[in-house]
């Protein structure tokens, strides 16, 4: 968890600290949302349970060339224990269901914030 | 807009259960959590339990651990507090409650923001 | 279990002037993440209850800013600049930081 506090970090993050920042990220991709957020793309939907993080990237990491999403895709990496490179896909992605990214975002903001405030950081 | 309407009111004899229920409108519950709360005659208010409808999971108070079952159902917008093994000191006014979270706050838990009317449960024999 | 104990038990106020109740925590009431969920909640005769304050000092949408919340770790306090007729009933302090979260006993604000 050391770099998500950005690159110029001083030093390893509290868990609790990483977790808020990732829902200020999305909070401020949905409140920032003007257009299609990327374009409409579709990822597969994700079970929102533990290994969560890593499929939530698995997911995010097909959509290419958004760069709203991609300070999202660096904060979940740091979170996910291994490498994650596109095309990969774990247990977790719900393989018959693809969403827009916009409404993952919403649904994946709003189980990390349930995360938050049960005190579940990692 | 925003409502929580339960079930009526329930006599019921000792060491049997009750369930009552919580109609949810004006917004999702899998965006909240679900809370119950009962207050016995003149007495204050004592916090049951609650839970999380987008996964089931459950929060309950010790004392009423075993005795209380909280479930939802995402379809019909509902919840519903079980309580077995009744005895004449579950007497009381029963509320449902929500906390509700949105996309456009950081941290934005908002308490128990909105209560349902309140079931009486009447235990006698 | 956290017990919440309010003081005083009854509060009768004459219109127009302040009213503060207290709130005080068995042990620090501080969340894992940094949170405090200190809420208050006022129920009217015959009503249910409805949120006024969380997290110590938020008021919620629809409160009149004549209601005020302060404190930390162990003590908290609702503070009522102006107590008008409307504002009988009874104030609760709840605690949602630990499980079992718990409510104080109640706090009775009548007129006068």
């Known amino acids: 968890l050391t770099c998500l506090g950005g690159f110029a970090s001083p030093g390893p993050v509290p868990p609790s600290t990483a977790l808020r920042e990732l829902i200020e990220e999305l909070v401020n991709i949905t409140q920032n949302q003007k257009a299609p957020l990327c374009n409409g793309s579709m990822v597969w939907s994700i079970n929102l349970t533990a290994g969560m993080y890593c499929a939530a990237l698995e997911s995010l990491i097909n959509v290419s060339g958004c760069s709203a999403i991609e300070k999202t895709q660096r904060m979940l990496s740091g979170f996910c224990p291994h490498k994650v490179s596109a095309g990969q896909f774990s247990s977790l992605h719900v393989r018959d269901t693809k969403i827009e990214v916009a409404q993952f975002v919403k649904d994946l903001l709003l189980h990390l914030k349930k995360l938050f405030r049960e005190g579940q950081f990692n | 807009q925003v409502q929580l309407v339960q079930s009526g009111a329930e006599v019921k004899k000792p060491g049997s259960s009750v369930k009552v229920s919580c109609k949810a409108s004006?917004?999702?519950?899998?965006?909240?959590?679900m809370h119950w709360v009962r207050q016995a005659p003149g007495q204050g208010l004592e916090w049951m339990g609650t839970?999380?409808?987008?996964?089931?999971?459950?929060k309950y108070v010790p004392k009423f651990q075993g005795r209380v079952t909280i479930t939802a159902d995402e379809s019909t917008s509902t919840a519903y507090m079980e309580l077995s093994s009744l005895r004449s000191e579950d007497t009381a006014v029963y509320y449902c409650?929500?906390?509700?979270?949105?996309?456009?706050?950081?941290?934005?838990?908002?308490?128990?923001?909105?209560w349902g009317q309140g079931t009486l449960v009447t235990v006698s024999s | 279990d956290i017990v919440m104990t309010q003081s005083p038990l009854s509060l009768p106020v004459t219109p127009g002037e302040p009213a503060s109740i207290s709130c005080r925590s068995s042990?620090?009431?501080?969340?894992?993440?940094?949170?405090?969920?200190l809420e208050w909640y006022l129920q009217k005769p015959g009503q249910s209850p409805r949120l006024l304050i969380y997290k110590i000092s938020d008021r919620f949408s629809g409160v009149p800013d004549r209601f005020s919340g302060s404190g930390s770790g162990t003590d908290f306090t609702l503070k009522i600049s102006r107590v008008e007729a409307d504002d009988v009933g009874i104030y609760y302090c709840f605690q949602g930081s630990h499980v079992p979260w718990t409510f104080g006993q109640g706090t009775k604000l009548e007129i006068k």
């Open positions: 042990q620090n009431i501080v969340h894992i993440n940094g949170n405090t969920y």
């Open positions: 839970i999380d409808p987008a996964n089931g999971n459950t």
């Open positions: 004006g917004f999702y519950i899998k965006d909240t959590y």
């Open positions: 409650a929500r906390s509700i979270y949105d996309d456009y706050h950081v941290d934005d838990y908002y308490a128990m923001d909105y």
